[in-house]
Structure formats: structure tokens, C-alpha cells
């Protein structure tokens, strides 16, 4: 199990790419328009 | 209007230092991300970071990561990177782009050139 | 990273007659929200990118339906209806959907 695990990860693969791949959605969404789905869109005065 | 306005670019050695900043003005600058994107002269375009709206989220390129850091205010409107240990292959037109509804950069500045040259 | 493909990278077209771009990427641009955030951009002649689509097929606010997007997955493609004198310039594939956000090469279009 543990050796399966390991060879993953030293599959061309690190942590932090992982991370980005898996980074939630709430998350992701705060990098562009953040209100977009919760108060309708726009964002302009 | 919507619109960013990017300044600070110039002509630097490399090795040194330079703080750009991008303006924004006509909408809601705290409720979008922003992001910096490149040009190289004659070149095609390539994203370099974001900073999430309220700047607890960032991300980099590995081309400056470790070297570059994004930042904002949002009391003054305004997004900043602050480029360290600049390379020659540095050298481009650094463009502020707003992350807009769809995942999209809808918004562009005009640009600032930085030029890292001995 | 994702790797983003576009062909032609140069492409003369004659004025009123159509256009079209193909756009590739390496892996699947369908993000776990069930979109796909790619985009399409133009830049002309000394001057900064402007958003045309956004993911896939949506006309930005301004941009003129001779321009649409369509695609899924890993293939993508910008067409103009029209060519017109003030479509010169290279337009751009971009891929929103993972870190690190990437850019296709871009395609050239100009008049014959």
C-alpha cells in the first residue's frame, strides 16, 4: 500500500500540483468574479 | 468606465528590483480576482500570477515563483507585483487582467514594459 | 501544465469570406463544476488582448455574433462568419480551468 502510495507521487507529481489540480471550488471561484452564482453577475457601478 | 491602468515598468539590470502596480477604476475592484499576464517582445502570451478578491489566495507561474509576489489594496483600487532578482527573459509587456464572470479575463490594461537589460 | 495547440498558426483570409481557428489542449478542459472554461481572445495590432469567448461559446458583451465558439473536451474552435478589415490581428486560445493557466501560441489573420 505505502509503496503504491510513494510511486505516485514520484510519478513527474508533487504535492503542491496536486493541490492545484484539487483546490476546492470555493476556492478557485475567489479568482475571478467572487460573487458570481451568490448575487447574480455584473459587478460594475 | 471599466477599466486597469498599469505603470511602474522601465528599464532594470538584472538582478534588481521593480514594483508594478495596475489601477483599476468602474467596478467593484474587491469582488473580482487579478492577474498579471506577459508578453514577450513578438512573443505570445503567458500568465504569471493571480491574487484572489480579498487576497487570501494566490497563485504563480514556476517561471517567478519564489521571485515575484502579488498583491493588493482594495482601499486604494489597486493590484501591485513586486518583481525581485529580475532575468533577462523577464523582459516583456506586463498586462493586469481582471477575472471576470466565466473564469474569463474580461478586463485589459494597455500594458507596461519592463525591460532587464545590462 | 495543460498544454494549449492551435492550427493554422498563420492564416490569410479574404474579406467578407469565413474563418476558422482550431484549438487543442493536452487534457480535458472540463473543470469538477461540470463547465469548461476556455476562452477565446484578440489582439490587434499594437494593442492589448480583448476577451471574444468565454467558456466555449459565450460572445463577451460587444463582441459581434460574426464571431462564435464551439468545441468540447480537448477541441475547440473560433469561427468569423465575415471576415472584416478589423479582424487583423492574433487570436488566442486560453485554458481557465487549472493551475498553471495557459495560452495557445496564437494564430495570425490577415488579408490576402
Known amino acids: 500500500k505505502h509503496k503504491c502510495f510513494r510511486n505516485s507521487l514520484e510519478n513527474n507529481e508533487t504535492l503542491e500540483s496536486i493541490m492545484n489540480t484539487l483546490e476546492s471550488e470555493e476556492d478557485f471561484r475567489k479568482y475571478f468574479y467572487y460573487l458570481e452564482g451568490s448575487k447574480g453577475g455584473g459587478g460594475s457601478k | 468606465q471599466v477599466q486597469v491602468v498599469e505603470s511602474g515598468g522601465g528599464v532594470v539590470q538584472p538582478g534588481r528590483s521593480l514594483r508594478l502596480s495596475c489601477a483599476a477604476s468602474g467596478f467593484t475592484f474587491s469582488n473580482y480576482g487579478m492577474h498579471w499576464v506577459r508578453q514577450a517582445p513578438g512573443k505570445g502570451l503567458e500568465w504569471v500570477t493571480v491574487i484572489s478578491y480579498d487576497g487570501s489566495n494566490k497563485n504563480y507561474a514556476d517561471s517567478v515563483k519564489g521571485r515575484f509576489t502579488i498583491s493588493r489594496d482594495n482601499s486604494k483600487n489597486t493590484l501591485y507585483l513586486q518583481m525581485n532578482s529580475l532575468r533577462a527573459e523577464d523582459t516583456a509587456m506586463y498586462y493586469c487582467?481582471?477575472?471576470?464572470?466565466?473564469?474569463?479575463?474580461?478586463?485589459w490594461g494597455q500594458g507596461t514594459m519592463v525591460t532587464v537589460s545590462s | 501544465d495543460i498544454v494549449m495547440t492551435q492550427t493554422p498558426l498563420s492564416s490569410p483570409v479574404t474579406l467578407g469570406q469565413p474563418a476558422s481557428i482550431s484549438c487543442r489542449s493536452s487534457?480535458?478542459?472540463?473543470?469538477?463544476?461540470?463547465?469548461?472554461?476556455l476562452s477565446w481572445l484578440q489582439q490587434r495590432p499594437g494593442q492589448p488582448p480583448r476577451l471574444l469567448i468565454y467558456k466555449i461559446s459565450n460572445r463577451f458583451s460587444g463582441v459581434p455574433d460574426r464571431f462564435s465558439g464551439s468545441g468540447a473536451g480537448t477541441d475547440f474552435t473560433l469561427k468569423i462568419s465575415r471576415v472584416e478589415a478589423d479582424d487583423v490581428g492574433v487570436y488566442y486560445c486560453m485554458q481557465t480551468t487549472q493551475f498553471p493557466f495557459t495560452f495557445g501560441p496564437g494564430t495570425k489573420v490577415d488579408i490576402k
Open positions: 487582467a481582471r477575472g471576470g464572470s466565466g473564469f474569463a479575463f474580461d478586463i
Open positions: 487534457q480535458s478542459l472540463v473543470r469538477s463544476d461540470g463547465n469548461t472554461y
